[in-house]
Structures are given as structure tokens and as C-alpha cells.
């Protein structure tokens, strides 16, 4: 039997076992987070599926994800939001230890989609496991990119108090205006709710003692934030390993000196 013709995209296809993975993650999340016990995971999956199934995968809108966003509504306490850019693993290691702080991936919708890829096809109910649109080579309005833009916007909009962001000091652009943080989250922090943004610049090299808070891209971030009437602070994290260790054991004598 000849397989039906399907569009070939430049990106990798939908993650294998995508529907079951989303359902399993949803169930696990609602079991671990009592405040989300009311969530019906089958409805969450139906809303997720509804956002991209049968739709042309280069024409997905934020509107498509609104039913899912509504089902996954969650609030983070003030001063407890941690944004990150190009340093996901450390940010997640941090919130795994500092359990009262939250990245987007610690929230239901971010947790469901973390590290997954998905797309459908126009006019069929099938999931495309062969290929999905690449953001650069194919289109930016693809199911995955639009999802992260949608939930990142919402995450930033609902943040309050002092918001923290972890930035990768090893990158040529420590603050990148084209990242999700730089293009979406920064512009959706609400000045009436957010008093300050505190950047933590994570150093890569062991002997790197430069003050990366003076980096031109950090100054650019400070300018954008200040213009939005939000105060800006910056800290160098010279030793990320020690930083995590001190979050785990704040009483450790070596943690009284700088990190």
C-alpha cells in the first residue's frame, strides 16, 4: 500500500508516543501538585490536540492554544518566578532544590511540553511523526514555537514582585533580544505588578572573575527594563556548582563567602 503523500519539513517529527507522554506527564503533575488535582488530563490532552491537529502547521496562532491555556491556569506567588535564557538545565536544577521558586517548566503546561516536538497536518487527524516545521528553515508560526511563545507570554504577564532571570554568561550575547526571554517575557512583565527584575549571570569558566553585569548586552537589558519602569539588579554567579551547593546547604561555612 502506498503511503499517503505528506508535507516534508526540515525539522524533526513529533516526539514518539507524544499523546501518551503528555497524558502521563499530566497525570504525574496533578498527583504531585495538590492544587492541580481538579485538572482532567483527558480534557487537557483534547485541548492540546485541538490546538494543532488538522491545522496547517505553519499557520498556528496563539488563539489556537487558548483553550489549553485556560485549562492550565496556575499562579506563582510573588517573588517566586524564575525566568531563564540559554541555561535551562541549571535553572531547573535550582528550582528542584529551591522548591518554592518556579520556572515555566515547573508549571503544568511547561512540564507537559518540555523537550517535546509536535505537529499535525492540514485536513487530517494524524500526528506527523516524520517531520515538523523548523523555526528558521520553514516557518516561525509552527505548533511548538507558538506554544512556547503563548505560555511564556502568560507566565511573564502573571509574574509579580521581584522576578529573577538566569542568564548564560558563556554566550557571546548574554542577553539575546531574539530569545524567548528577550522577545517575549521581558516585554510582558507588568510594571504595576513587578517591582524589579534581578538577573543572575552564570559564569562558565572556573577562573572567570570578570564582572559580566557590565556586559553591553546586560546594559541593553537594563535599559529596556528601566524604560518599562521596572527596577533592574544584576548579580554574578561565579561558581554555579557552589551556588547550587549553597542553595542545598545554606549553613555551609564556605557559603558565607561570595559565589
Amino acid at each position: 500500500v502506498l503511503p499517503r503523500w505528506r508535507q516534508q519539513w526540515s525539522g524533526s517529527g513529533t516526539t514518539s508516543r507524544f499523546p501518551e507522554t503528555v497524558l502521563a506527564r499530566c497525570v504525574k503533575y496533578t498527583e504531585v501538585h495538590p492544587e492541580m488535582r481538579h485538572v482532567d488530563c483527558q480534557s487537557v490532552w483534547d485541548a492540546f490536540k485541538g490546538a494543532f491537529i488538522s491545522k496547517y502547521p505553519c499557520n498556528i496562532t496563539e488563539e489556537d492554544y487558548q483553550p489549553l491555556v485556560k485549562l492550565g491556569t496556575q499562579t506563582v506567588p510573588c517573588n517566586k518566578t524564575l525566568l531563564w535564557s540559554r541555561i535551562k538545565d541549571l535553572a531547573h536544577q535550582f528550582t528542584q532544590v529551591q522548591r518554592d521558586m518556579f520556572t515555566l517548566e515547573d508549571m503544568l503546561l511547561g512540564y507537559l511540553a518540555d523537550d517535546l516536538t509536535w505537529c499535525g497536518e492540514f485536513n487530517t487527524f494524524e500526528i506527523n511523526y516524520q517531520s515538523c516545521p523548523d523555526w528558521r528553515k520553514d516557518c516561525s508560526n509552527n505548533p511548538v514555537s507558538v506554544f512556547w511563545k503563548t505560555v511564556s507570554r502568560r507566565f511573564a504577564e502573571t509574574a509579580c514582585g521581584v522576578v529573577h532571570v538566569m542568564l548564560n554568561g558563556s554566550r557571546s550575547k548574554i542577553f539575546d533580544k531574539n530569545s524567548t526571554f528577550g522577545s517575549v517575557e521581558v516585554h510582558n512583565l507588568q510594571p504595576e505588578k513587578v517591582q524589579a527584575l534581578e538577573a543572575w549571570v552564570i559564569h562558565g569558566g572556573r577562573e572567570d572573575s570578570r564582572d559580566l553585569c557590565q556586559d553591553p548586552t546586560i546594559k541593553e537589558l537594563e535599559s529596556i527594563i528601566s524604560k518599562r519602569n521596572i527596577r533592574f539588579f544584576c548579580k554574578n554567579i561565579y561558581r554555579p556548582d557552589k551556588f547550587l551547593q549553597c542553595v542545598k546547604n545554606p549553613e555551609d561555612s564556605s557559603c558565607l563567602s561570595g559565589i
Epitope: P19, E20, L23, A24, V27, Y129, Q130
Partner: antibody, heavy 121, light 110 residues
């Protein structure tokens, strides 16, 4: 009525081949992940292989059959297949096909009656 | 040897409550969806519990499932003679990249 019906079992010599079929009816076959599960005489259930919904592009195998068995599906015929090559005595079992129901969080909610495969010289 | 460990046998008298355990790890029960199957002598298995603790329609409410961490269990209350069967837990295993069944538990109604 939702039904799965296996066929193709029989007696085969070690090293031989056999193709099992599982005919599905009463549901939209290509919407479902499908699985093969076997049960050796007097033993427990052992998962053998699984194929993704729609075009069946994702296939999974138990280590014990990897490289010897091939799962496939023909949605136009509503049929699931298991091509079994290089058969061994330890492949002797009743082979069941099962449907994984998304609405039941991928529990295997429909099973066939099974087809018996005997590998013996 | 299955990655999901079940006791080989369990027994109880009519009316009693029995529990069958299924022990695994983070790569299976810890992160995935657990289902339970009943296999009466000489018949194909039947889905008894899905999503750790949900019963398909037609399954008596005497059967209940639960999950905690990397273990799951099936409880049968008000035991009846027709419950005499083999019971299997099952889930996906991320390390094996395949599904796994427990070794099965033979339930005897005394």
C-alpha cells in the same frame, strides 16, 4: 462490535518464519496504537511489540525479539501484522494483539482471542 | 525477569479484601501510566484498571487501583470465587523503550 481476530499461528521449525495477522473491526483502526503480547505455556504475559497510530512510523520491540520480528499495519485492510523470523523454541506462546485506548490512558482495552505459535523440530 | 515485581501468589476467603502490589522504578511506574489486567483461566486478558486508579465501565467497584511513587497496587474487596484469576500490572518503561508487564499474581479464593 469492537473486535480483534488473530490468525497465522501454527507449528514451525526452529529458524523458520511465520506471519501473524490481526484483523480489526468495529472501530477506526488507524486512530489506535496497536500491540502484540505473548504468553508462553504456564507463564505470564510478555509484551512483544507496538506500532504507533496512523502511518505506524514508530515501532517498538522487546529485547527478546529485536532484529527478528517486524511489526506493521495496513490501515486500508484494518490489519496488524507480526512477521516472525529466525524463530526459537522460546518463542512458543499464544500471541495476542491488543488495542491501546487513548481515552483509557493507553490501557489495552480490546484483546483478540490469541493464536498459538509452536516452535519445535 | 520483569522490571515490574509482583508477588507470585495471593489468597483470601470470600468477602475478604486482598491487595496485590507492583513494584517498579522511576523509569516505569514513577513516570508512566499504570494499568491492571485480569486473566481468567483459558481466556484473553481483560483491562481492569487504567491510569493507576480508573475503572472501565463494567468493572465492579470492588476493584480499585492506586499508585505511590514507584509502586502501584490493586485492591479487591468483598472477594468472590469468580475473582480467582491471574492479575498483571503493566506500564511503559523509558529505559527499555518498551512496555512491561509484571510477572503476574495468581489469586486463589479459598
Amino acid at each position: 462490535e469492537v473486535q480483534l481476530l488473530e490468525s497465522g499461528g501454527g507449528l514451525v521449525q526452529p529458524g523458520g518464519s511465520l506471519r501473524l495477522s490481526c484483523a480489526a473491526s468495529g472501530f477506526t483502526f488507524d486512530d489506535y496504537v496497536m500491540s502484540w503480547v505473548r504468553q508462553a505455556p504456564g507463564k505470564g504475559l510478555e509484551w512483544v511489540s507496538e506500532i504507533s497510530e496512523s502511518d505506524g512510523s514508530n515501532k517498538y520491540y522487546a529485547d527478546s525479539v529485536k532484529g527478528r520480528f517486524i511489526i506493521s499495519r495496513d490501515n486500508s485492510k484494518n490489519t496488524l501484522y507480526l512477521q516472525m523470523n529466525s524463530l526459537r523454541a522460546e518463542d512458543t506462546a499464544v500471541y495476542y494483539c491488543a488495542r491501546l485506548e487513548p481515552e483509557k490512558y493507553y490501557g489495552m482495552d480490546v484483546w483478540g482471542q490469541g493464536t498459538t505459535v509452536t516452535v519445535s523440530s | 525477569q520483569s522490571v515490574l515485581t509482583q508477588p507470585p501468589s495471593a489468597s483470601g476467603t470470600p468477602g475478604q479484601r486482598v491487595t496485590i502490589s507492583c513494584s517498579g522504578s522511576n523509569s516505569n511506574i514513577g513516570n508512566n501510566l499504570v494499568s491492571w489486567y485480569q486473566q481468567l483461566p483459558g481466556t484473553a486478558p481483560k483491562l481492569l484498571i487504567y491510569r493507576h486508579d480508573h475503572r472501565p465501565s463494567g468493572v465492579p467497584d470492588r476493584f480499585s487501583g492506586s499508585k505511590s511513587g514507584t509502586s502501584a497496587s490493586l485492591a479487591i474487596s468483598g472477594l468472590q470465587s469468580e475473582d480467582e484469576a491471574d492479575y498483571y500490572c503493566a506500564t511503559w518503561d523509558d529505559s527499555l523503550n518498551g512496555r512491561a508487564f509484571g510477572g503476574g499474581t495468581k489469586l486463589t479464593v479459598l
